[in-house]
Interface confidence: medium
């Protein structure tokens, strides 16, 4: 198996970015909602996730991943169009199969180079690589049909379909090692709100006790937890009203078909 | 170019809490294509990977079971830093401690300078 | 947990020798091994990634080689500089291990 030294895109590695705020650090700024929103880093040349306190803050704060890279990335419109236009594939989908560190037992997809087909394999949970899809379809659009994609060459992130490693919650063992569950969530089709109100409460890394609130979508209801003070996900609000107003929107009435797996 | 600024004391008490700080420049605590680690090297063990940190949407943890029930690796967001704790220390845990970032696959790229932290009353 | 072991603990060669280091793994970790350099008072340094890849900036006179449970790092002329010792890793598996290291001393 061959594998990456560094996952950078080195096509990016020595531009600077279209505007100055760009280079400005994510600001959170003074205030406590919990709004997920996009910042370009500087240093990875990516536009990543960070948490909004909802007031103040910089210019380099998006609502949308492809907002930031539209606005902060240069020539990210014109590597889309090539990308849609099949003149080539993203790197890693010419990576071996890599089922990562962990021993868990995860439904995954590769691009095969050999076979020029998008094919299963068994991801063990943590780390690996980026070819790697949670769904057939994902992977043919990004790395087998190109041409047919409107998926550009950089809007891949590995946050965007993969779930690695130990969560702090939701865990079992496998052979001894600690490997992640998929999150009982209803069905994406009942609830159209944000998709952050989907995920499971997660009290984080740390040692604090705070009281936060989260939205349970299968009761439609928010319900209290204790929060540790790092780390955790965007479900995750200061007052039950704040949760309500956030989440309790998206639900679509009578149609509520329970949690999967 | 990545680096790894480490910091803290050099000398704990038996059963206190070793604490050491890794402050990052040139990549993000959390950035989506890497891991951060704290690795020892004591003359007794040789290199022992103690555990890493990584966010992919959110955070996540491995630790080595040897240290699991004391270990603590935290990310610091604000401060672009991780850190590690080591609960109720003792001489066996005098050694050299490194921060490393790892990439997608585990291998550790850069590294911290270390911090040589002696248990001892 | 999966052991390493580093075969010879240390040896002594020339300025222009070639220089062999084995690494053998307690199980099949396919091609999941790093190679480490560490120079006194220094942190550990990657070479070689995925038992082949040469990590950038180093040089091209080391090289990494094998598979499932038996690997191989050579320096095929030895320098000054490479007067160190060197460190297996494997990441198949967690915990991450690594070898107890080959000192390469000067003869």
């Known amino acids: 198996l061959s594998e990456e030294a560094d996952d950078t895109d080195s096509e990016l590695g020595s531009m600077k970015p279209l505007h100055t705020f760009c280079a400005m650090k994510a600001d959170d700024g003074p205030c406590k909602a919990m709004i997920r929103s996009y910042f370009f880093n500087m240093y990875t040349h990516q536009c990543e996730e960070f948490i909004y306190g909802g007031c103040e803050g910089n210019e380099n704060r998006f609502d949308t991943l492809e907002e930031c890279k539209k606005t902060c990335i240069p020539g990210y419109e014109k590597t889309a169009v090539k990308a849609a236009s099949g003149a080539e594939r993203p790197d890693f989908c010419f990576l071996e199969e890599d089922p990562g560190l962990c021993r868990g037992y995860m439904k995954r997809y590769l691009y095969n180079n050999q076979t020029k087909q998008c094919e299963r394999f068994v991801y063990g949970g943590c780390l690996g690589n980026r070819n790697n899809f949670e769904t057939l379809d994902e992977c043919k659009k990004i790395c087998e049909n190109p041409v047919h994609s409107p998926s550009p060459v950089n809007e891949v992130q590995m946050s965007d379909y993969v779930t690695d490693g130990n969560t702090v919650t939701d865990r079992s063992t496998v052979n001894n090692i600690v490997v992640p569950q998929s999150p009982k969530v209803p069905r994406r089709r009942d609830y159209r709100g944000r998709p952050w109100c989907l995920q499971p409460a997660d009290s984080g890394l740390c040692k604090a006790s705070e009281r936060r609130f989260y939205y349970n979508s299968a009761t439609g209801k928010c319900h209290r937890f204790n929060y540790t003070g790092c780390g955790g996900n965007n479900n995750n609000f200061t007052t039950r009203r704040r949760c309500l107003r956030s989440c309790k929107t998206g639900l679509i009435k009578n149609k509520s078909k329970g949690v999967v797996k | 170019q990545v680096q790894l600024q480490q910091s803290g004391p050099g000398l704990v008490k038996p059963s206190q809490t070793l604490s050491l700080t890794c402050a990052i420049s040139g990549d993000s605590v959390s950035s989506n294509s890497a891991a951060w680690g704290w690795i020892r090297q004591s003359p007794g063990r040789g290199l022992e990977w103690l555990g890493i940190?990584?966010?992919?949407?959110?955070?996540?943890?491995h630790y080595a079971v040897s240290v699991k029930s004391r270990i603590t690796i935290n990310p610091d967001t604000s401060k672009n830093q991780f850190s590690l704790q080591l609960n109720s220390v003792t001489p066996e845990d005098t050694a050299v401690y490194y921060c490393?970032?790892?990439?997608?696959?585990?291998?550790?790229?850069?590294w911290g300078q270390g911090t040589l932290v002696t248990v001892s009353s | 947990d999966i052991q390493m072991t580093q075969s010879p603990s240390s040896l002594s060669a020339s300025v222009g020798d070639r220089v062999t280091i084995t690494c053998r793994a307690s199980?099949?970790?396919?091609?999941?091994l790093a190679w480490y350099q560490q120079k006194p008072g220094k942190a550990p340094k990657l070479l070689i990634y995925a038992a082949s890849s040469l990590q950038s900036g180093v040089p091209s006179r080391f090289s990494g080689s094998g598979s499932g449970t038996d690997f191989t790092l050579t320096i095929s002329s030895l320098q000054p500089e490479d007067f160190a010792v060197y460190y297996c890793q494997q990441r198949n598996g967690f915990p991450l291990t690594f070898g107890q290291g080959t000192k390469v001393e000067i003869k």
């Open positions: 199980q099949d970790i396919r091609n999941n």
């Open positions: 940190i990584y966010y992919r949407s959110k955070w996540y943890n």
């Open positions: 490393a970032r790892s990439n997608w696959s585990g291998y550790f790229d850069y």
